[in-house]
Interface confidence: low
C-alpha cells in the first residue's frame, strides 16, 4: 500500500449558541493532525497559542490590531448572521418518530425477556423514551443503545426493557419528542397473537364440545327415562 | 451551561494525497460541503438550497490558505507526520428489519484518521454499487473523522452483506458482516396443548353429544308412533 | 526594516525570457506566501501569480499559464518569476507583494519596469 | 472570473469633504476576502482595508470599509491632501483573484 507519510490541517471555526443568540461563543480552531496549535476564543479576545507550535501564529496575529477586531465582531457577523440563515431548516427541523415494539428473544411467557422499543427517523435528536408494565414505568432493567445519529439528518435509538412477561400483562413504550404535541404510546400484550388464537380455539373447542355432548346426553337421558318399562299413559282428555 | 446548538464550519488539506475539505456542521449533521472538483455547493439534504446559498468559490481560497497554513506547520513541526488512528466500525438498519420490505443498510465509520478510506459493500461477498451512498469526512470532537456509507436493500434469509473497510491504520481491511435473524416463533407449549386438548375434546364432544342426540331424538319418534296402550 | 525589492526587469523582444526577483528582509520569507501583480502603463493592477511558503502550491492569472512560472528560494529569501514567451501586452510594472488568500498584499515591493517591444 | 466594477471612475471632491467609492462583484464575494488599495503616481500600491471593513496597520481612521456579497464601499470620511490617489478595491476570495478598474479621487 501507500505507506508515504501523511501530514493534515485541520480549521474548525465555531459558533457556540446558548438560549438561542442570546449569549454566543465564537471560536477559531487550528490544527496540525489532531492537535490543536492556536485559537481566537471570542471569551478570551485574541489568539492564543494551545501547544508551542501556535506561538509564531499567536504573536503575529495578535499584532494585528484590525484582524482581532474582525475575530471579536465574528460572533455577530458570522455566527449569529449564520444562525439566522439557517435557522429555518436546522434549529425549527422537526420529523417525528415511528415506533415499533419487539421481543428481542422468542421466548415463551415465564422466561426472561428483552422487549425492544425501536424509535427511529426523527430530529432533533433530545427524545425521551419510557416503558411501562400495566401502567406502571419500569424503570429497573431499562437499557439503551443511546442516541443514534444516521447521518442524514435522523436520529433512532432502541430502549430495552428486561423482564419476565406474564400472561395477561400490558407493556407501554411512551415516546415524548418535541415534534409531538402529546406523547407516543405503543402497547405490547404479554402473548402473542398465535398463542391467544390456538387458547381461544382450544377453549372454544372444548365448551363447544361440552355443550354439545351435555345437549346431546340430556335428550338421550330424557327421552330414555320418558320411555322406561314400556308404560306409557294416554293423553287425559 | 451546556449550548443549546453548534455550527461549525470544518476545513481540512492533506498532503501529499492534495485532498481538501470545506463542509459547515450543525449539532454534528452535515449541512453542506463543496465538491472541490466541481466548484459547487452539494447540500445534505436537497431542500437545505431552497432556504439558503452557500458562494463555493470562497471555500477553494480557504482551502488554498489551509494548504498554505499546512506547508508552514509541516516544515515548522519537523516534518513530524501524522499517527494513523484505525475505524471502529458499526454495521445497522434505517430502521427494524421486516422480511421484503425496503431497508437501509448504514455502514459508520468513526473515530479515524487521516481522512482517507476506502468502502465497499459486499452482497454475499460479492461487491455491491448500485443505489449506495456515503457523506464527506465528518469532524469530532476529539478531531478524529466519521463517516457514513449507505446500501438500500430488500431483506432476504438468504442474503449476507459485509461492509469492508480498508484503512491505514488497518492491518488487514475490517469486515462488518449482516444478515436477516429470522425470529423462530415461541414454543407456545401450553397454548399447544390447550388447543389440541380442547379441540380434540371438542370435537369428541360435538359427535358424541351428535350421537346422542340423534339417538335421543329418534327414540322420542319411535315413541310416539307407537301411541297409547 | 521590513521591505520586498524587485530586479531583473528591462527591454526584452517579444517571444524574449526574462527572470524577475524579489529579495525580502525583515520577516521570515519562508511562513508568507507570495504573490507577483502587475500594471500596463496608465492601466489598473493585476493579478498573476501566487505561491504558497514552502513553494509546494502555484497559482497563476489565465492571461500567464504555461508561459510564466513563479518559484522561490527561501534559504535566500527570495521569489523569482521566470516569463517566456512574452508577448506585447505583458509590459508593465511588475510589483512582488507579500500574502495571499487569508491575507490580501499587506507589503509591496516598489516594482520592476518590463518592456516588450521589438 | 469575479469581474469587479469601481464606481465613479472619477471623484471630484475638495478637502474636508467625505468620499464614497463603490465596488460591485459579477458574483457573491466572501466578504472576509475583499481588500481595498491606494495608489499614488509613481508608488505601489498600499493596503488600507482587508476583509471589507478592518483596517490595515497604520490606516487612519478616516478610512473605513463597508459591505457584503456584491456591494462594496470604501468611504473617507474628511478627505485630507494625501488622500487624493487611485483606490483600487480586490477580491482573493476566488482564484484568479481579480481588482478592480479603480476609481480616481481628485481634487476639485
Known amino acids: 500500500g501507500d505507506t508515504r507519510p501523511r501530514f493534515l490541517e485541520q480549521v474548525k471555526h465555531e459558533c457556540h449558541f446558548f438560549n438561542g443568540t442570546e449569549r454566543v461563543r465564537f471560536l477559531d480552531r487550528y490544527f496540525y493532525h489532531q492537535e490543536e496549535y492556536v485559537r481566537f476564543d471570542s471569551d478570551v479576545g485574541e489568539y492564543r497559542a494551545v501547544t508551542e507550535l501556535g506561538r509564531p501564529d499567536a504573536e503575529y496575529w495578535n499584532s494585528q490590531k484590525d484582524l482581532l477586531e474582525q475575530k471579536r465582531a465574528a460572533v455577530d457577523t458570522y455566527c449569529r448572521h449564520n444562525y439566522g440563515v439557517g435557522e429555518s431548516f436546522t434549529v425549527q427541523r422537526r420529523v417525528y418518530p415511528e415506533v415499533t415494539v419487539y421481543p428481542a428473544k422468542t421466548q415463551p411467557l415465564q422466561h426472561h425477556n428483552l422487549l425492544v422499543c425501536s424509535v427511529n427517523g426523527f430530529y432533533p435528536g433530545s427524545i425521551e423514551v419510557r416503558w411501562f408494565r400495566n401502567g406502571q414505568e419500569e424503570k429497573t432493567g431499562v437499557v439503551s443503545t443511546g442516541l443514534i445519529q444516521n447521518g442524514d439528518w435522523t436520529f433512532q435509538t432502541l430502549v430495552m426493557l428486561e423482564t419476565v412477561p406474564r400472561s395477561g400483562e400490558v407493556y407501554t413504550c411512551q415516546v415524548e419528542h418535541p415534534s409531538l404535541t402529546s406523547p407516543l404510546t405503543v402497547e405490547w400484550r404479554a402473548r402473542s397473537e398465535s398463542a391467544q388464537s390456538k387458547m381461544l380455539s382450544g377453549v372454544g373447542g372444548f365448551v363447544l364440545g361440552l355443550l354439545f355432548l351435555g345437549a346431546g346426553l340430556f335428550i338421550y337421558f330424557r327421552n330414555q327415562k320418558g320411555h322406561s318399562g314400556l308404560q306409557p299413559t294416554g293423553f287425559l282428555s | 451551561i451546556k449550548e443549546e446548538h453548534v455550527i461549525i464550519q470544518a476545513e481540512f488539506y492533506l498532503n501529499p494525497d492534495q485532498s481538501g475539505e470545506f463542509m459547515f456542521d450543525f449539532d454534528g449533521d452535515e449541512i453542506f460541503h463543496v465538491d472541490m472538483a466541481k466548484k459547487e455547493t452539494v447540500w445534505r439534504l436537497e431542500e437545505f438550497g431552497r432556504f439558503a446559498s452557500f458562494e463555493a468559490q470562497g471555500a477553494l481560497a480557504n482551502i488554498a490558505v489551509d494548504k498554505a497554513n499546512l506547508e508552514i506547520m509541516t516544515k515548522r513541526s519537523n516534518y513530524t507526520p501524522i499517527t494513523n488512528v484505525p475505524p471502529e466500525v458499526t454495521v445497522l438498519t434505517n430502521s427494524p428489519v421486516e422480511l421484503r420490505e425496503p431497508n437501509v443498510l448504514i455502514c459508520f465509520i468513526d473515530k479515524f484518521t487521516p481522512p482517507v478510506v476506502n468502502v465497499t459493500w459486499l452482497r454475499n461477498g460479492k461487491p455491491v454499487t448500485t443505489g449506495v451512498s456515503e457523506t464527506v469526512f465528518l469532524p469530532r470532537e476529539d478531531h478524529l473523522f466519521r463517516k457514513f456509507h449507505y446500501l438500500p436493500f430488500l431483506p432476504s434469509t438468504e442474503d449476507v452483506y459485509d461492509c469492508r473497510v480498508e484503512h491505514w491504520g488497518l492491518d488487514e481491511p475490517l469486515l462488518k458482516h449482516w444478515e436477516f435473524d429470522a425470529p423462530s416463533p415461541l414454543p407456545e407449549t401450553t397454548e399447544n396443548v390447550v388447543c389440541a386438548l380442547g379441540l380434540t375434546v371438542g370435537l369428541v364432544g360435538i359427535i358424541i353429544g351428535t350421537i346422542f342426540i340423534i339417538k335421543g331424538v329418534r327414540k322420542s319418534n319411535a315413541a310416539e308412533r307407537r301411541g297409547p296402550l | 526594516e521590513v521591505q520586498l525589492v524587485e530586479s531583473g526587469g528591462g527591454l526584452v523582444q517579444p517571444g524574449g525570457s526574462l527572470r524577475l526577483s524579489c529579495a525580502a528582509s525583515?520577516?521570515?520569507?519562508?511562513?508568507?506566501?507570495m504573490s507577483w501583480v502587475r500594471q500596463a502603463p496608465g492601466k489598473g493592477l493585476e493579478w498573476v501569480s501566487a505561491i504558497s511558503g514552502s513553494g509546494g502550491s502555484t497559482y497563476y492569472a489565465d492571461s500567464v499559464k504555461g508561459r510564466f512560472t513563479i518559484s522561490r528560494d527561501n534559504s535566500k529569501n527570495t521569489l523569482y518569476l521566470q516569463m517566456n514567451s512574452l508577448r506585447a501586452e505583458d509590459t508593465a510594472v511588475y510589483y512582488c507583494a507579500r500574502g495571499y488568500g487569508r491575507y490580501s498584499p499587506d507589503l509591496w515591493g516598489q516594482g520592476t519596469l518590463v518592456t516588450v517591444s521589438s | 472570473d469575479i469581474v469587479l466594477t469601481q464606481s465613479p471612475a472619477t471623484l471630484s471632491l475638495s478637502p474636508g469633504e467625505r468620499a464614497t467609492l463603490s465596488c460591485r462583484a459579477s458574483?457573491?464575494?466572501?466578504?472576509?476576502?475583499l481588500a481595498w488599495y491606494q495608489q499614488k503616481p509613481g508608488q505601489a500600491p498600499r493596503l488600507l482595508i482587508y476583509g471589507a471593513s478592518s483596517r490595515a496597520t497604520g490606516v487612519p481612521a478616516r478610512f473605513s470599509g463597508s459591505g457584503s456579497g456584491t456591494d462594496f464601499t470604501l468611504t473617507i470620511s474628511s478627505l485630507e491632501p494625501e488622500d487624493f490617489a487611485v483606490y483600487y478595491c480586490?477580491?482573493?476570495?476566488?482564484?484568479?483573484?481579480?481588482f478592480g478598474q479603480g476609481t480616481k479621487v481628485e481634487i476639485k
Open positions: 525583515g520577516f521570515t520569507f519562508s511562513s508568507y506566501a
Open positions: 458574483q457573491s464575494v466572501s466578504s472576509s476576502y
Open positions: 480586490q477580491q482573493y476570495s476566488n482564484l484568479p483573484f481579480t
